[in-house]
Structure formats: structure tokens, C-alpha cells
């Protein structure tokens, strides 16, 4: 399955929206910096496409989960957040279209269970950090910057998938 060109554009729009969502300078939040241990190895180029789609799906779904909480709604501009949801939703649709094309409805695609778990644990660490920091503006800014970085890395994987065709 070819992820459509629109998926690439959607990823870039998502990154742009994340950049626009910034409310305070990250430099004023240096004391709140944190290493969340993004599992970069799970997004390596060595995987087959059928193995990468579940990991990309998990990444996008978890970003959706993170930014669709009540605490998130209070932290960010509502209009930008709505646009952000729409972009993520469309990217999930693109991946779903690939899954439907590639497998029978009763079959399970090749699942990278460990990789999926690693992505979930990464987002659990982010959620715990926000909770510990009481969802402060600086904590959210650190998380926004982290998601920009990790989403950008996963987008690079999508690009490398397309170039492998």
C-alpha cells in the first residue's frame, strides 16, 4: 500500500500546527526539561512496511489521546487544537486505508507488539511527567516540543518508506 502524498502533507501540517501552538518560550522552561526516552530504535528503517504501520498508527493514536484530554484543552488554543485533531484523524484514516487494502478483515497484520508497547510506555512517561508537574504551562511546552521532535522522527520514517517503493 502506498501512503498517499496527502499523508505527507498532513504530517507537515501537523508539525506546523504544533509549532503554532507554542505559547511560551522553551528557554524560560529550561529547569523543566526532561528526557522521555523516545524509542527511536522502534522507528528504524530496517523494518518491513507491514511492521512499521502499526508503530506509526500507535504514535499518531497516542498523540491524539494526549492532546484530547481536558487538561490539554485548557492548555492550548481551541481553534488550533481542532485543526490538529482533524489532521491526526486524517492520518489515522490514511493508515487504516492501508491496513484494509493489505489484509483480510479477519487476519491480523504483522504486529510489532514490543514496538507498540515501547511507544505506549513512552507516552505513559509523558503523561506521568505532566501529572507530576501539575500540568503547568512549562510542562506542556516541554511536552509540545518533545512531540514535535518525536513526530518529526516518525514522519522521516514515513518518507523513507515511500522512497523504498
Amino acid at each position: 500500500c502506498d501512503l498517499p502524498q496527502t499523508h505527507s502533507l498532513g504530517s507537515r501540517r501537523t508539525l506546523m500546527l504544533l509549532a503554532q501552538m507554542r505559547r511560551i518560550s522553551l528557554f524560560s522552561c529550561l529547569k523543566d526539561r526532561h528526557d522521555f526516552g523516545f524509542p527511536q530504535e522502534e522507528f528504524g528503517n530496517q523494518f518491513q512496511k507491514a511492521e512499521t504501520i502499526p508503530v506509526l498508527h500507535e504514535m499518531i493514536q497516542q498523540i491524539f489521546n494526549l492532546f484530547s484530554t481536558k487538561d490539554s484543552s485548557a492548555a492550548w488554543d481551541e481553534t488550533l487544537l481542532d485543526k490538529f485533531y482533524t489532521e491526526l484523524y486524517q492520518q489515522l484514516n490514511d493508515l487504516e486505508a492501508c491496513v484494509i487494502q493489505g489484509v483480510g478483515v479477519t487476519e491480523t497484520p504483522l504486529m510489532k507488539e514490543d514496538s507498540i508497547l515501547a511507544v505506549r510506555k513512552y507516552f505513559q512517561r509523558i503523561t506521568l511527567y505532566l501529572k507530576e508537574k501539575k500540568y503547568s504551562p512549562c510542562a506542556w511546552e516541554v511536552v509540545r516540543a518533545e512531540i514535535m521532535r518525536s513526530f518529526s522522527l516518525s514522519t522521516n520514517l514515513q518518507e523513507s518508506l515511500r522512497s523504498k517503493e
Epitope: F64, N65, E96, T108, I116, R120
Partner: antibody
Amino acid sequence: QVQLQESGPGLMKPSETLSLTCTVSGGSVSSGSYYWSWIRQPPGMGLEWIGYIYSGGGANYNPSLKSRVTISVDTSKNQFSLKLNSVTAADTAVYFCARGIPMVRGILHYWGQGTLVTVSS
Amino acid sequence: EIVLTQSPGTLSLSPGERATLSCRASQSVSSSFLAWYQQKPGQAPRLLIYGASSRATGIPDRFSGSGSGTDFTLTISRLEPEDFAVYYCQQYGSSPYTFGQGTKLEIK
């Protein structure tokens, strides 16, 4: 093959909170990339999607019910549940739980047999 | 939300005949994210078609789906006695996921 079984109260009074449970066998509610859904069907009527919960956390609800509904997972019992607040006669329906294929939110492939909930004073 | 309108409401045919069921969406259904279900009295719905035209595993090849955008069709090429039931279309391309009101296929 995954099997789903709904359980709940059967008869309720208006303004009460409906609690339904879907017990899953032949698969785990917390592993894989699955969306676990609730759907309802008023007697002699069509189907209405209530919402889903994702195996990795996060739920999505039908806006028409969003203010009253919560879907949650109990991994220790391998169950997922539906809570619907302030029920009225309009909530009388057969409630189904369902699951699709990995990573696809809307396809409903495996269904429970349904449980009838009647709201009456 | 996307409203799905099914027609006809009731279709009366005899075994061996061809059935054509229609589902029209109020707006375009993205990526042909449309499914068809069959429901018999007292039973849960059964998935027949997904992605507008892909048959679910175990579904006989007399069932076929077609269409894209806003117009979709379920065709049963040669009706068997067990095919008489209610048929629902469902879109799962945008939330909330919605169902048509159903078409009842009855024996003439």
C-alpha cells in the same frame, strides 16, 4: 477466535446510571491495536454507534451521547464497560459490544449477542 | 455528521432473484470507508462488506459491494432463503460513525 459477552441490569428506572460490561475471551483488551466499541439498537429500530475505547488508552464518543457516556477498560478482568448517566425511556435498547480488526476504528467484525436494557418507571 | 439513507425501505423478492440495495451518503465517505451488515431477528449484525467492496471472510461470493463518494450499492446476485434479513450500511470514515436506517429484504 475472539468472543464477546455483554452483561447488565435488564430493567432500570429513569435518571439512574446504566452500567454494562463486555467480557472478552480469546483475546486481550489491552494488547494489540484494537478498538472496542459499544453500539445500541432501540426495539424495532436501526443501529447507533455509542463510542469506542482503544486498547492503548483513549476513547471516542458519539457527540449525541458524549455528555452522559464513559467507556473504560478493566484489564485484570479482561472486560470493557459502558456507563450511561441519567437514562430515560429513549435509552431503552439492545446494547451490543463489538471489536474490529487491528488499527481500524469503525469496522465491527466480532459482536456480542446483545443485552436488552429497558428504562421504565 | 454523515447521514446515510438506504433505499428501498423494504424489498420483496423471491429466492433465486437478484437484489440491489442502495445507500446514499449526505457527504462523501472518505477512502470508501463503508461497510454493509446483515441482521436477522434476535441476532447481532454480521459484517458482510468493508471498504465498500471487500467481502469479509466467510461471506459467500453472491454478495458484492460497489460504489464510492456518496453512492454505494450492495448486490446479492442470487437470493438464498437465508439471505432474507435486514441490511444496514455504515460509514466509518468520519466520527461519529453512522448507520443507515436499514433495508428489509423479505420473501415475496
